[in-house]
């Protein structure tokens, strides 16, 4: 019988008492084969973290700063359940740390030196740790003691709880630096008042502070937020302009064998029976013998943290950067106006080899990081382990939902002004063998399908989106008799046709021979009835253009396109017979890397782009013999996006809507994790 006990860690006598009450009340409402609570008492949160890591306890609820400690080796804990605030309809699990300024003050984030600052309190998250952590490498050296460095950075501050004797500048705007509400500039409202009164130029608070202190929109419009990209935004655009997104209070558990499903089962049942307004005799979110015992008193319930989400992703890049800077106190030696090498994310060993060759030729401008799937790469870019990669539109959508931005677009047509003219897109098509003359768009049910990969534009999102509108369910593996759609569940019929050996079968990378455009076409040639690819795929792999044994004798005339009206047309008539127009592949990165990625990639394409004529004797960025490694092989250049610099603007309303509709069919664990952070 599996042990269904969750050992909860308590950090005080009062918590232990509430834990015992929690245990007893859960016993009374949950069947004997359901989850149960046991209580473990430790002296501190750090002791609880160590106990969970050592398998002496299973769960504890932590503030964001401690979630970071819990994640660090050797603890390796992960977030499993989040408390939420507000209503069930609009649950808030995060708050945003922001920098508020007056509208007419005219400076940006990178011009804070010499300004006057208002903080909620020394050592507090939104008011100190996050802003000072993010500004850490701009502080004058020596950076220790930190208070002295901050005092020398700003021309005056109010940082309640600071030592006014040793660091008088930190108390210049609020004499005495009192550490309670007796100091009018203490806490969130106090820091905002410090700005409002004109004592300071910037207040470091949370996003709700301004709304709680100014009910009138006209008053709020006198203020703006400083964004990390050195722009400003209105105060209600905090989701796109903040210093960090911070989880409020989170249950953590072991990453391996951490009982996360059991913890969720326990807490979900607990909130049903003892949540807000559920029971008089025991209340989960109430602390008669103290404050915030086990859970925050202000919490309204729990939400399960998606399993794909580790602590780094949950806390977010900005928060982790700020806390790491403060804890480790290390800053890059390079001058900040110089671009560091761009860490390119390469999928599996084929891409890694090409990336390595690029790295050698770039003489240090490009470095390479490997991952097994596109989603793993996106996650690495999110958390700073990698910086950039080029993505199909379907993954540009996921990357965008995860906070990344497009920087340059692949262009596939030769033109005089290639780099300045991003194209409208390419065509997603359905290809069949000419010999299968009875096959049309209307009778694909039961046929064998070949897809570039799950989540990609031409191979999945467009054809499956159209199919979904017809069949109104997500069981595509039942619609087709079998197929190869790399990235599907291994036991799915949509992996049956794939050719990868062993663990590589149906993997969404080049270790699976039927992956990508060329792979999906090969799947059609060798096993399938229909392939969902781009309009250039057939000509690129026929007429001897692909020398691989399976392709060298193929003839374009032996293939036809399925049109949505039920007719068929020759391959060259793709403009009048396609499923939809697809946005070109695009390079994505984090917002903070946007300028450097743009600059370095433009330099790199001038050195190694399509202007290089002899690819046998020189490195060519856009060539890999039909394998589309790092970039599509038919890329002519990487083009500026001009104002299409967000994923929505880049992909276009129609495509975003189409992918949005398919979301209910999504198996993307990363998309689930990212929409948890930003619904």
């Amino acid at each position: 019988v599996p042990d269904k006990t969750v050992r909860w860690c308590a950090v005080s006598e009062h918590e232990a008492t509430k834990c015992q009450s929690f245990r007893d009340h859960m016993k009374s409402v949950i069947p004997s084969d359901g989850p149960s609570v046991a209580c473990v008492k430790k002296a501190s949160y750090l002791d609880c973290i160590r106990a969970i890591a050592a398998n002496e306890a299973d769960a504890v609820t932590l503030d964001a700063g401690l979630v970071y400690d819990a994640y660090l080796a050797p603890n390796n804990l992960k977030p499993v359940v989040a408390e939420f605030y507000g209503s069930k309809e609009d649950p808030q699990t995060f708050y945003y740390a922001v920098a508020v300024v007056k509208k007419d003050s005219g400076f940006q984030m990178n011009q804070l030196r010499g300004k006057k600052s208002c903080h909620t309190g020394l050592g507090r998250s939104a008011g100190w740790n996050i802003p000072i952590g993010l500004l850490y490498c701009d502080l004058p050296e020596p950076r220790k003691p930190l208070e002295k460095a901050v005092a020398n950075f700003f021309s005056g501050s109010c940082a309640p709880c600071a030592d006014g004797t040793d660091f008088p500048q930190l108390c210049q705007l609020c004499p005495g630096c009192g550490c309670s509400t007796l100091n009018q500039y203490f806490g969130y409202s106090g820091a905002f008042k410090c700005l409002k009164d004109g004592a300071g130029d910037v207040a470091f608070v949370k996003h709700s502070t301004i709304f709680e202190n100014l009910a009138n929109k006209a008053d709020r419009d006198q203020y703006e937020l400083l964004c990390l990209d050195n722009t400003r935004k209105p105060v209600d655009e905090y989701k796109d302009c903040h210093l960090a997104q911070v989880p409020s209070h989170t249950v953590v558990a072991r990453s391996m064998g951490g009982k996360e499903d059991l913890i969720w089962e326990l807490l979900n049942q607990a909130q049903e029976h003892f949540g807000k307004d559920k029971s008089k005799e025991f209340q989960l979110f109430s602390s008669p013998h103290g404050k915030d015992l086990l859970f925050k008193d202000s919490a309204h319930g729990f939400l399960k943290v998606p399993p794909r989400m580790d602590a780094k992703m949950y806390l977010g890049y900005e928060y982790v950067t700020a806390i790491r800077n403060l804890r480790e106190g290390t800053c890059p030696e390079a001058p900040t106006d110089e671009c560091k090498p761009v860490k390119w994310c390469a999928l599996s060993h084929h891409e890694r080899l090409k990336c390595d060759e690029w790295s050698v030729n770039s003489v240090g401008k490009i470095e390479c990081v490997s991952a097994e799937t596109t989603e793993d790469c996106i996650a690495k870019i999110m958390n700073g382990e990698a910086d950039a990669m080029s993505l199909d539109g379907g993954f540009v959508y996921i990357a965008g939902k995860c906070g990344l931005v497009p920087v340059l677009a692949e262009n596939y047509n030769k033109s005089d002004n290639c780099e300045d003219t991003p194209e409208a897109g390419y065509f997603a098509i359905a290809v069949v063998k000419k010999s299968a003359s009875d096959l049309t768009w209307d009778n694909l049910k039961g046929k064998k399908s070949c897809h570039t990969a799950v989540g990609r534009t031409a191979g999945w999102n467009i054809p499956m989106g159209l199919l979904y509108n017809k069949i109104n369910h997500c069981r595509f593996d039942e619609f087709f008799s079998e197929g190869c759609a790399p990235g599907s569940k291994k036991d799915s019929s949509l992996c049956k046709l794939c050719m990868g050996s062993g663990l590589n079968l149906c993997e969404p990378n080049n270790k699976e021979g039927y992956y990508g455009y060329t792979g999906a076409f090969r799947c059609l040639v060798e096993k399938g009835d229909v392939a969902f690819v781009k309009h250039q795929t057939v000509p690129q792999n026929t007429g001897g253009k692909n020398p691989d044994p399976w392709a060298k004798n193929l003839n374009e005339k032996d293939y036809e396109l399925l049109c949505l009206d039920g007719t068929r047309k020759p391959v060259e008539e793709y403009a009048n017979c396609h499923l939809a127009r697809a946005p070109n592949h695009a390079v994505v990165t984090r917002k903070d890397k946007e300028a450097c990625v743009h600059k370095i990639l433009r330099q790199q394409q001038h050195l190694f782009g399509s202007n290089v004529t002899d690819c046998s004797g020189n490195f060519c960025l856009f060539r890999s013999e039909t394998k589309d490694l790092l970039f599509r092989d038919d890329t002519v250049c990487l083009a500026k996006l001009h104002d299409r610099n967000t994923y929505e603007k880049y992909l276009g309303e129609e495509y975003v809507k189409a992918v949005g509709n398919l979301r209910k069919c999504s198996t993307s664990s990363l998309l689930e994790a990212c929409t948890f952070r930003r619904p």
């Epitope: 060993h349 080899l353 090409k354 050698v360 046998s616 490195f619 060519c620 890999s624 013999e625």
Partner: nanobody, 117 residues
Framework: QVKLEESGGGLVQPGGSLRLSCAAS????????MAWYRQAPGKQRELVAG???????NYRDSVKGRFTISRDNAKNTMYLQMNSLKPEDTAVYYC???????????WGQGTQVTVSS
């Protein structure tokens, strides 16, 4: 694709030196980029150093200042001079030439380098 063969490995004490050679069966004059990789037991294969046709070189951070890559197009050979060797340099060392543009994962036998006292 030219055939490549590595040699020059051996057992050496920490602080010692070795020179690895990579001999090509055909001309390497037109090969765009050549490189040395290494693979320690239980670890991923990693790029150590690379050299372009024009002689530009690039090194992984942990070997910068200790290792030097060079190529002699006349002798159709590439070299890796390894000085101040450390125990963590212990691995099988492979050379590659990327020339096919297929980026297939084909590797020779490699040459074993062991740094131990």
């Amino acid at each position: 694709q030219v055939k490549l063969e590595e040699s020059g490995g051996g057992l050496v004490q920490p602080g010692g030196s070795l020179r690895l050679s990579c001999a090509a069966s055909g001309s390497i004059f037109s090969i765009a980029t050549m490189a040395w990789y290494r693979q320690a037991p239980g670890k991923q294969r990693e790029l150590v150093a690379g050299i372009t046709r024009s002689g530009s070189t690039n090194y992984r951070d942990s070997v910068k200042g200790r290792f030097t890559i060079s190529r002699d197009n006349a002798k159709n050979t590439m070299y890796l001079q390894m000085n101040s060797l450390k125990p963590e340099d212990t691995a099988v060392y492979y050379c590659t030439d990327y020339s096919s543009r297929y980026y297939h994962d084909y590797w020779g036998q490699g040459t074993q380098v062991t740094v131990s006292s």
